[in-house]
């Protein structure tokens, strides 16, 4: 079995987590997506799920989870907005593509939030950003019940992430307001 | 097929200004990130800017910030780059590029020359 | 910013020989890593992206492997098509660094 690998982000409160998960465009494009968080001792949860069929470029939000899929690049964009130190933990993407189990997009996140000023750039972001709006109108998408809690047996590919403290225009709910509903029949 | 066209490169003097266009057909503009990515005569490629298809992020190399403008016109599908201040060290082949992370089509670039 | 490096600048391999490039970042970029192929007088295009993922039409002779801050970039049998320039590039994080380029050629 392929080891299973950590990228540890240390943020403040306040901040982005901006985390690109590569796929193969031409396996993956329409499949959907989700982003879970893996708590010790127990399974994956889904906090936040692309729809099904995942669209184009059309972001999904979930409280302060945003979900980009990129068909034409083969890239699934998780942001975090307004992070907190409660979200802490370890994260992953993953593609569900039923009746198999959920399919590893890359090395997980090890997010780790702490309490601070977050008005300046994040450890991982310098000057370079100049404009960052959250989108005003983004759907919320249904996610599988399901997660799995295999070991990984393929090469797991790929993501990273990125931080920045975004100029938000609108109030995000907590991540943990979701309803969990299946959506396979 | 994904085709990108650059316009508008030419010759200016320093402290000069240009404003380079890209004609995007073959995909959905209005979907996809978009970049300008440049390269000095004999040199390495060198990213300038990326903004997202709704222009609610715009990102900027340090060196061009506040003198260069990436903007975009969904309903035309055309990308732009008002060039401000210009310098001899701007002097380079500009690309247009599909894609606002890595780069997936590139146009054949528009040479723009910064002499006096 | 990450600095990406990228070594040897010139290899000389024969055709139908393995070559092997490498680019190292100096911090971790996960695997967001890609890799470009640019012909004298031609614009750039992308031959690998997540460090090991071929693009579309990318034939299988093409790899990439590496993560965190080792990469490297394979061409089993060089074919006359594959001399040319390639860069890696980052894009972990703002701004978007690529590395300074190996020219392959003919030995």
């Known amino acids: 079995a392929t080891k299973l690998t950590e990228e540890k982000y240390e943020l403040k409160e306040g901040q982005t987590l901006d985390v690109k998960c590569d796929y193969t465009l031409e396996k993956f494009a329409s499949s959907q997506k989700a982003w879970q968080i893996i708590r010790d001792g127990e399974m994956p949860k889904t906090l936040a799920c692309t729809e099904r069929p995942s669209k184009n470029s059309h972001p999904v939000q979930v409280g302060r989870i945003i979900l980009e899929d990129y068909h034409d690049h083969g890239l699934l964009r998780v942001r975090m907005v307004n992070l907190q130190v409660e979200d802490s933990g370890l994260y992953q993407c993953v593609i569900y593509q039923p009746p198999k189990e959920p399919h590893m997009l890359f090395d997980r996140i090890r997010l780790v939030v702490t309490k601070g000023f977050s008005g300046t750039p994040g450890s991982n972001e310098n000057s370079t950003q100049n404009v960052y709006k959250i989108p005003p109108t983004t759907t919320k998408a249904l996610c599988p019940l399901y997660t799995s809690p295999r070991t990984v047996t393929q090469a797991p590919p790929k993501s990273t992430a990125d931080v920045s403290t975004p100029d938000s225009e609108i109030n995000l709910t907590n991540v943990t307001d979701i309803i969990r509903v299946p959506v396979f029949n | 097929e994904v085709q990108l066209v650059e316009s508008g490169g030419g010759l200016v003097q320093p402290g000069g200004s240009l404003r380079l266009s890209c004609a995007a057909s073959?995909?959905?503009?209005?979907?996809?990130?978009m970049s300008w990515v440049r390269q000095a005569p004999g040199k390495g490629l060198d990213w300038m800017a990326s903004?997202?298809?709704?222009?609610?992020?715009?990102y900027y190399v340090d060196s061009v910030k506040g003198r260069f403008t990436i903007s975009r016109d969904n309903a035309k599908n055309s990308l732009h780059l008002q060039m401000n201040s210009l310098r001899a060290e701007d002097t380079a082949v500009y690309y247009c590029?599909?894609?606002?992370?890595?780069?997936?089509?590139w146009g054949q670039g528009a040479l723009v020359t910064v002499s006096s | 910013e990450i600095v990406m490096t990228q070594s040897p600048a010139t290899l000389s391999v024969s055709p139908g020989e393995r070559a092997t490039l490498s680019c190292r970042a100096s911090?971790?970029?996960?695997?967001?890593l890609a890799w470009y192929q640019q012909k004298s007088g031609q614009a750039p295009r992308l031959l690998i992206y997540?460090?090991?993922i071929r693009a579309t039409g990318i034939p299988a002779r093409v790899s990439g492997s590496g993560s965190g801050t080792e990469f490297t970039f394979t061409i089993s049998s060089l074919q006359s098509e594959d001399f040319a320039v390639y860069y890696c590039?980052?894009?972990?994080?703002?701004?978007?660094?690529l590395g300074g380029g190996t020219k392959v050629e003919i030995k």
């Open positions: 590029v599909r894609g606002g992370w890595r780069f997936e089509s």
């Open positions: 073959g995909f959905t503009f209005s979907s996809n990130w």
């Open positions: 903004m997202k298809q709704d222009g609610s992020e715009i």
């Open positions: 911090q971790s970029v996960s695997s967001n």
């Open positions: 997540g460090a090991s």
């Open positions: 590039q980052q894009y972990k994080n703002w701004p978007l660094t």
